[in-house]
């Protein structure tokens, strides 16, 4: 991490991200200072940009549920700082407002 504050996503990406390349996600919430609700998916490759997605979309909900129930070997993230190399496109600086990281749960919630 480069210690920078997390930016707000201003619009949803038109592309989608394959489930198996996603490491975790975090929620962007308007109540915490960002203009739109969003889910930001963090790719396994830390050099790749986060993908900003609409939480109402079915594919987004599926991927979130998958990540929620999958045990993770990752250590919990420190705060909510962006990974080095994250894209700034379509984002607005908002300090650390609106940033809530959800790493994969350690307890599977599956069947």
């Amino acid at each position: 991490s480069d210690g920078g504050a997390q930016d707000c996503c201003l619009k949803y990406s038109q592309r989608k991200i394959p489930a198996k390349v996603v490491r975790s996600y975090r929620k962007q919430e308007p109540s915490l200072g960002c203009s739109i609700p969003a889910i930001l998916f963090l790719p396994r490759k830390r050099s790749q940009a986060e993908l900003c997605a609409d939480p109402k979309e079915l594919w987004v909900q599926q991927l979130m549920q998958h990540l929620d129930k999958t045990p993770s070997p990752q250590k919990p993230a420190q705060g909510c700082r962006k990974d080095r190399g994250a894209s700034k496109t379509g984002k607005k600086g908002k300090g650390s407002k609106g940033c809530k990281r959800t790493e994969r749960s350690q307890t599977p919630k599956g069947p």
Partner: antibody, heavy 117, light 107 residues
């Protein structure tokens, strides 16, 4: 106990319409996506349609696109499938299934739809 | 549209290992699940996320998924395992597909 109970099946003529319902109980309905899956007599499973938790996002199999509409009423814990312009090949047992991530973890017992003149 | 291909039937001797394959273009890049269906009954989930077992499903059931093939393996096959088995996966557009199904016979 987690349960899904389909209803609304029956005999309908080609070109006709039918609305299936699926009553959910035993779980927080609006925390799950839901799907319809069908099975023609003696044939395999065919996914029909899916809907997101609050009903905003929907997807359909090519075979039913433009004819079938999936919807849900979270206040009634009920999933629906409106089927229009029915064809003989739509004859099947229709199952309601609860989605979690990338799989179906709870299934109903199904309701039979027969399209015949 | 995307298709998943399964053998129509697989036979296994009692107590031996059965393997049911599911072929699809780069299915290994997606998550596969498997369902067991006995005559007159609704399907039951036996494997999800390629290789995870739901509670209540015996350890004899396992799964793998790589490249263009997902595989359901049933070790120490029992008479009660006789059923139709279906693989399934979702694409990135939240469209699902099932394989054609495989009838497992335990000899």
């Amino acid at each position: 106990e987690v349960q899904l109970l389909e209803s609304g099946g029956g005999l309908v003529q080609p070109g006709g319409s039918l609305r299936l319902s699926c009553a959910a109980s035993g779980f927080t309905f609006n925390s799950y996506s839901m799907s319809w899956v069908r099975q023609a007599p003696g044939k395999g499973l065919e996914w029909v349609s899916a809907i997101s938790m609050e009903g905003y996002s929907k997807s359909y199999a090519d075979s039913v696109k433009g004819r079938f509409t999936i919807s849900r009423d979270n206040s009634k814990n009920t999933l629906y499938l409106q089927m229009n312009s029915l064809r003989a090949e739509d004859t099947a047992v229709y199952y309601c299934a609860r989605g979690y991530g990338y799989y179906f973890d709870v299934w109903g017992q199904g309701t039979l739809v027969t399209v015949s003149s | 549209s995307y298709e998943l291909t399964q053998p129509l039937s697989v036979s296994v001797a009692l107590g031996q290992t059965a393997r049911i394959t599911c072929g699809g273009d780069s299915i290994g890049s997606q998550y596969a699940s498997w369902y067991q269906q006995k005559p007159g009954q609704a399907p039951v989930l036996v494997i999800y996320d390629d290789n995870e077992r739901p509670s209540g499903i015996p350890e004899r059931f396992s799964g793998s998924n790589s490249g263009n093939t997902a595989t359901l393996t049933i070790s120490r096959a029992q008479a009660g395992d006789e059923a139709d088995y279906y693989c399934s996966s979702w694409d990135m557009d939240a469209v699902n597909v099932f394989g054609g199904g495989t009838k497992l016979t335990v000899l």
